[in-house]
C-alpha cells in the first residue's frame, strides 16, 4: 500500500484489544482544505515504541488503515480512497509492548467536519438572576454548535463549563459570577451533533468585574477656607485596585471599576441644585458650606457600596462684613460684593438649633451698587429673622448657581432678629455700696451677649438728680459690672444700662434710683 | 428565509470563458454552503460543484474538475458565489441553478439536501 492512501488490507499487527488504561483517546477528524482532510488524538501512557494506526470503515462494510507511525495526527486527501462524502467510522489503533490498544470510534462525514470558528468580535456580558449572561454573534455560516466555556479568578487555575447546544443566529451561555473576584472567561465552539468534530481555538479573554464592586477605602481632607471664600477637597487615599486573572492583566475591558464622587450641599436648601457627581480624580473647590461626600464604586453591573462622609460647615465668622440697617419698610442686609452678576444665597438660622430648621433666600444676579456693595432687603411681614433672638447669618456667592462647585461663601457672621434694641435691654440692674463715694452697678447679661459679636459695648448712664449732670460709661461686652465712683453722700442718683450693637444704639433699662447715705462720726 | 438570484448566462464560443454570480440575501448567516447545479431539458439536475462558506473549500463534479471555479464574497447578510467557467465546451449549455443548504450532515450532490434554489440562469456554449 502507497503510504498516502487507506490500506484495504489487514493491519500488520494482531487484532485484540488489550483492555488496558492507556492508550489512544479523544480523536479528532476533520476538514483543513478543499481536498485535504486532518485527524488527531490523544495517547495515554509511554509513548516509546508505540506505533499508530488510524482505522476506518466506509458504509460499505470495507475497511482501510493509515500507519502513523509515533505521530499522533495525520493528514491524507480526498483521493486516499476513504469516502468523505459519505459517513464512515474511525478509530485509532495502538500498537506498543506486543498488545493493541484502541480509541472509542467517531462516525462522521469527513466532507462537512469542518473546525469551527470561536466567538468572535463583541461578546456582551450581562447579569442575570446572579448568574453572567454572555451573548454574541454566530459567526457566519455556522450555525449549529457546541459550546463550552472556561473561567478563572486570580488565585484558581481554569474550571471548564458547559454552555448546552446552541442553534440560532445568536449564541449565549450562562455562568457563574463571583460576589467579590473578577474573572477571566474564554469561549470555544464545535459542530453540533458531529461526533469527533474538533473545538476551535479558545476565544479571546472576557474579563468580568466581581458582582460587587470593591467598596471604596478612601480618605479626604478638606484645606481652610480661602480669601476667595473657597477650600479644596483632597483624598488622602487612592482606591485599591482590583487583583485580575493573568489573561485580563494589562488591558482589561469589562473589569474597570469606576468611583464617583458625589456631594451634596447641605447648607442653603433653596438653590437649584443640591447634588453633583464627578469623577474621583477630579477633586472639587468647596464653599464654606457644609456637605455631604459620597464616594461610589461601579463596574458594568451597576453601583456597589458607598462611602460617606459628612463635611462640617466651616464656622470661623466675620464680625464686620455685614451691615444691617432696620427701617421702617424692614431690613436690608450690606456686604462687600463679590463681583457682577452673582447669585447670593443668603441662609439663617436660629442658633442652638438644629441644622434642619434652616431658612435661606436666593437674590436675583446683582452687580455691586456704588459702594461696591451687594444688598439683600426683607420686609417685616416676611417674618425673616423676625423673633427676637439669635441667628447665624451666611451668605454665598455663584457666577453660576446651577454649578454646586461653584458656589463661595462670602461671609459669616450673628444677627440678633426683631427689635434688637429693645430686647438687648439689660434687666435685674442693682446697686451697691462699694466705699465712701463709689457704688458698685450689676445686671444681667443681655440676650445680646448671646450673639457673637453682636454686642458691641454697655453703656451705664447715671444722673445727678440736684444737678441734673449726666455721665455714661462704656463696659466691654463681657462685663456686667461697673463701679461708679466720685458720687456724693446725700445725693440721690439714678442709673440706666443699655446694651449697643455697631449700628443700634440699645434702649435704657428702667431707672434705677439710689444714694449714698451721709457717714455721721461718733 | 434565503433568496437567490443568479445572473450572468449567455452565449458564448466554444473554448470560451463565462462567470456566472448568485447573490444570497435573507439569513444567510444560517447557511452552511451553496452549491451550483445544471440541467438540460428532459434529464435531472446535475451537481457541478459546492463551497462551504465558513471555510471556502470546495468540490467538483469530476466533469467540470480544473475548468470551473467557485469563490464567494461574504458581507453582512448577503453572499455572493462566483462559478468562473473556462474551456467551455458544447456539453456545458444547460441552465444553470444555485442552491443553499442550512444542514451540516448533507452530501453535495444530492438536490433534496438544499432548502434554497435560485431561478436559474441560462448558459449556451456554441460552436
Known amino acids: 500500500c502507497r503510504t498516502s492512501e487507506c490500506c484495504f488490507q489487514d493491519p500488520p499487527y494482531p487484532d485484540a484489544d488489550s483492555g488496558s488504561a492507556s492508550g489512544p483517546r479523544d480523536l479528532r477528524c476533520y476538514r483543513i482544505s478543499s481536498d485535504r482532510y486532518e485527524c488527531s488524538w490523544q495517547y495515554e501512557g509511554p509513548t516509546a515504541g508505540v506505533s499508530h494506526f488510524l482505522r476506518c470503515c466506509l458504509s460499505s462494510g470495507r475497511c482501510c488503515y493509515f500507519a502513523a507511525g509515533s505521530a499522533t495526527r495525520l493528514q491524507f486527501s480526498d483521493q486516499a480512497g476513504v469516502s468523505v462524502l459519505y459517513t464512515v467510522t474511525l478509530w485509532v489503533e495502538s500498537w506498543a509492548r506486543n498488545q493493541t490498544e484502541k480509541s472509542p470510534e467517531v462516525t462522521l462525514q469527513l466532507y462537512n467536519s469542518v473546525k469551527y470558528e470561536p466567538p468572535l468580535g463583541d461578546i456582551k456580558v450581562s447579569k442575570l438572576a446572579g448568574q453572567l449572561r454572555m451573548e454574541w454573534e454566530t459567526p457566519d455560516n455556522q450555525v449549529g454548535a457546541e459550546v463550552q466555556f472556561r473561567h478563572r479568578t486570580p488565585s484558581s487555575p481554569w474550571k471548564l463549563g458547559d454552555c448546552g447546544p446552541q442553534d440560532d443566529d445568536t449564541e449565549s451561555c450562562l455562568c457563574p459570577l463571583e460576589m467579590n473576584v473578577a474573572q477571566e472567561f474564554q469561549l470555544r465552539r464545535r459542530q453540533l451533533g458531529s461526533q469527533g468534530s474538533s473545538w476551535s481555538k479558545w476565544s479571546s479573554p472576557v474579563c468580568v468585574p466581581p458582582e460587587n464592586p470593591p467598596q471604596p477605602q478612601v480618605r479626604f481632607s478638606v484645606e481652610q477656607l480661602g480669601q476667595d471664600g473657597r477650600r479644596r477637597l483632597t483624598l488622602k487615599e487612592q482606591p485599591t485596585q482590583l487583583e485580575l486573572p493573568e489573561g485580563c492583566q494589562g488591558l482589561a475591558p469589562g473589569t474597570e471599576v469606576t468611583y464617583r464622587l458625589q456631594l451634596h450641599m447641605l447648607s442653603c436648601p433653596c438653590k437649584a441644585k443640591a447634588t453633583r457627581t464627578l469623577h474621583l480624580g477630579k477633586m472639587p473647590y468647596l464653599s464654606g458650606a457644609a456637605y455631604n461626600v459620597a464616594v461610589i464604586s461601579s463596574n458594568q453591573f451597576g453601583p456597589g457600596l458607598n462611602q460617606t462622609w459628612h463635611i462640617p460647615a466651616d464656622t470661623h465668622t466675620e464680625p464686620v462684613a455685614l451691615n444691617i440697617s432696620v427701617g421702617t419698610n424692614g431690613t436690608t442686609m450690606y456686604w462687600p460684593a463679590r463681583a457682577q452678576s452673582m447669585t447670593y444665597c443668603i441662609e439663617w438660622q436660629p442658633v442652638g438649633q438644629d441644622g434642619g430648621l434652616a431658612t435661606c433666600s436666593l437674590t436675583a444676579p446683582q452687580d455691586p451698587d456704588p459702594a461696591g456693595m451687594a444688598t439683600y432687603s426683607w420686609s417685616r411681614e416676611s417674618g425673616a429673622m423676625g423673633q427676637e433672638k439669635c441667628y447665624y447669618i451666611t451668605i454665598f456667592a455663584s457666577a453660576h448657581p446651577e454649578k454646586l462647585t461653584l458656589w463661595s461663601t462670602v461671609l459669616s457672621t450673628y444677627h440678633f432678629g426683631g427689635n434688637a434694641s429693645a430686647a438687648g435691654t439689660p434687666h435685674h440692674v442693682s446697686v451697691k455700696n462699694h466705699s465712701l463715694d463709689s457704688v458698685s452697678v450689676d445686671w444681667a447679661p443681655s440676650l445680646l451677649s448671646t450673639c457673637p459679636g453682636v454686642l458691641k459695648e454697655y453703656v451705664v448712664r447715671c444722673r445727678d438728680e440736684d444737678s441734673k449732670q449726666v455721665s455714661e460709661h462704656p463696659v466691654q461686652p463681657t462685663e456686667t459690672q461697673v463701679t461708679l465712683s466720685g458720687l456724693r453722700a446725700g445725693v440721690a442718683y439714678t442709673v440706666q444700662v443699655r446694651a449697643d450693637t455697631a449700628w443700634l444704639r440699645g434702649v435704657w433699662s428702667q431707672p434705677q434710683r439710689f444714694s449714698i447715705e451721709v457717714q455721721v462720726s461718733d | 428565509e434565503v433568496q437567490l438570484v443568479e445572473s450572468g448566462g449567455g452565449l458564448v464560443q466554444t473554448g470560451g470563458s463565462l462567470r456566472l454570480s448568485c447573490a444570497a440575501s435573507g439569513r444567510t448567516p444560517r447557511l452552511v454552503a451553496m452549491g451550483w447545479f445544471r440541467q438540460t431539458p428532459g434529464k435531472e439536475r446535475e451537481f457541478v460543484g459546492e463551497?462551504?462558506?465558513?471555510?471556502?473549500?470546495?468540490?467538483?463534479a469530476d466533469s467540470v474538475k480544473g475548468r470551473f471555479t467557485i469563490s464567494r464574497v461574504n458581507a453582512k447578510n448577503t453572499i455572493t458565489m462566483y462559478l468562473q467557467m473556462n474551456s467551455l465546451k458544447s456539453e456545458d449549455t444547460a441552465v444553470y441553478y444555485c442552491?443553499?443548504?442550512?444542514?451540516?450532515?448533507?452530501?453535495?450532490?444530492?438536490?433534496?439536501?438544499?432548502?434554497?434554489w435560485g431561478q436559474g440562469t441560462l448558459v449556451t456554449v456554441s460552436s
Open positions: 442552491a443553499g443548504r442550512q444542514n451540516w450532515s448533507g452530501s453535495p450532490a444530492r438536490t433534496n439536501e438544499y432548502e434554497y
Open positions: 463551497i462551504i462558506l465558513s471555510k471556502g473549500f470546495t468540490y467538483y
